[in-house]
Interface confidence: low
């Protein structure tokens, strides 16, 4: 099992390498290098669950496998795991966990909470039996988590933007320091971009970098302290 | 989210115990579950996690000779067996989720109300 | 093993006062490909389960006040409550959600006055 991590962990330092063969696991093992980082990014995998939270391990007969970006509502699946949080795979296609189901309404399930303050769980006022057929609506003031759809950044959790992964717009992290990130040549080039990435966090802005060991055509972006 | 734990426990020493944690509300099969032991009046000590999707199962290698973890996906609950027990064992037990906090991390966001288990002949 | 170390084991404060506690790991929990530091801190009431505050050393969880405040990297954190209320009297636990094993402090116990 360990080896079949291996290829998912990025830059790794000596010590976090003999830490993972001796047989532990580091929080971001499963997918939080900075190979893995962006969603527009595909790293090998072995399982779904070495996958962050809103994507799939993908392993097609040829080629190495990767995490992909979950399958939506309506979407064709063959297992649960392709689909995003909240649906299931159902006869191939992906459908709300609870549509076919007679069970109490919860707005927001998986890994989006709506929760009282004193003990963590719903309110009462979220429960109500109800035929769910309909589909769920989010509160509004839910944020949602990497992965999720989103409309606009303040959809989404703190150290995250809402950016455009292939035909929707998903919540991706913000970029840290020494991540590659995309230099707006021109007002309102984002909208061209099938994978668009956050930009960079406070404090941080998207510079060419300058090393010698790459060519200066290849002009390649990362977010550096201003 | 809910993590229903089964009732208090009156073990004989030597008898084995299997406790479970029923989930709800969410995809079973997406999460890490975790046992967490806290002995009375003590801190928290971190037993093992078990993935329901394949039962992949990572134990904290001071239990994995007392603690046996796992799951039934068909009614999304989880199951700890404890062998052997003594009174060392006697203690609070609790299922908690993987908290998947944006990236994937092992904090735990969601706790069911504990089991105590009582090891006393 | 990653050890917690938490300091100080008791303290006794007056509602409205800010009130600090510690936490060391034996080593480093900022993971430096996402700069992100994986330590978590979970208040526990008397009789309860235990809840998580905090996350990624700074970051809280839905729900919880905003006097609830986690700083630090590297190897020391600290939890802040600006201004501690009566509702606040409870176990806190740093956990390094890192490396397995996981693992605990031996917790703060906060009393009030």
């Known amino acids: 099992k360990l080896n079949s991590i291996k290829s998912s962990l990025g830059g790794e330092t000596p010590g976090q390498a003999a830490n993972r063969s001796a047989g532990m696991y580091q929080g971001l093992a499963f997918g939080g290098s900075k190979k893995g980082k962006n969603l527009g990014q595909a790293y090998p995998c072995s399982s779904d669950k070495e996958c962050e939270v809103g994507r799939y391990c993908h392993s097609p007969h040829q080629g190495s496998s990767a995490c992909m970006v979950c399958r939506r509502k309506k979407k064709r699946c063959h297992r649960d795991g392709m689909c995003c949080p909240s649906t299931r795979c159902n006869n191939g296609i992906c459908i709300p966990v609870t549509e076919s189901i007679l069970t109490p309404h919860i707005p927001a399930l998986d890994g989006t909470r709506h929760r009282d303050r004193n003990h963590g769980h719903y309110s009462n006022h979220d429960l109500g039996w109800q035929n769910l057929g309909r589909p769920h609506t989010k509160m509004s003031h839910i944020k949602g988590h990497e992965g999720d759809p989103c409309l606009r950044s303040s959809d989404c959790i703190e150290g995250f933007c809402c950016a455009r992964h292939f035909w929707t717009k998903i919540c991706k992290p913000v970029l840290h320091q020494g991540e590659v990130c995309t230099k707006q040549r021109k007002k309102g080039s984002h909208g061209l971009e099938i994978f668009q990435r956050c930009d960079c966090a406070k404090g941080l802005s998207c510079k060419v970098w300058k090393d010698a060991t790459y060519s200066s055509k290849a002009r390649l972006h990362v977010c550096q302290k201003i | 989210v809910k993590l229903q734990e089964s009732g208090a426990e009156l073990v004989r020493p030597g008898a084995s115990v299997k406790l479970s944690c029923k989930a709800s509300?969410?995809?079973?099969?997406?999460?890490?579950m975790n046992w967490v032991k806290q002995r009375p009046g003590q801190g928290l000590e971190w037993i093992g996690m078990?993935?329901?999707?394949?039962?992949?199962?990572r134990l904290n290698q001071k239990f994995k000779d007392k603690a046996t973890l796992t799951v039934d996906k068909s009614s999304s609950t989880a199951y700890m067996q404890l062998s052997s027990p003594t009174s060392e064992d006697s203690a609070v037990y609790y299922c908690?989720?993987?908290?998947?906090?944006?990236?994937?991390?092992?904090?735990?966001?969601?706790w069911g109300q504990g089991t105590t288990v009582t090891v006393s002949s | 093993d990653i050890v917690m170390t938490q300091s100080p084991s008791s303290l006794a404060m007056s509602v409205g006062q800010k009130v600090t506690m510690s936490c060391k790991s034996s080593?480093?929990?900022?993971?430096?490909?996402?700069?992100?530091?994986?330590l978590a801190w979970y208040q526990q009431k008397p009789g309860q389960s235990p809840k998580l505050l905090v996350y990624?050393?700074?970051t809280r969880e839905s729900g919880v006040p905003d006097r609830f405040v986690g700083s630090g990297s590297g190897t020391d954190f600290t939890l802040t409550i600006t201004s501690v209320q009566a509702e606040d009297l409870a176990d806190y636990f740093c956990?390094?959600?890192?490396?397995?094993?996981?693992?605990f402090g031996a917790g703060t116990k906060l009393e009030i006055k």
């Open positions: 908690a989720r993987e908290g998947r906090l944006g990236l994937r991390s092992y904090a735990m966001d969601y």
């Open positions: 956990q390094q959600h890192y490396i397995t094993p996981l693992t």
């Open positions: 990624f050393a700074s």
């Open positions: 078990i993935h329901p999707s394949d039962s992949e199962t």
């Open positions: 080593q480093s929990l900022l993971n430096s490909s996402n700069q992100k530091n994986y």
């Open positions: 509300g969410y995809s079973f099969t997406n999460y890490w």
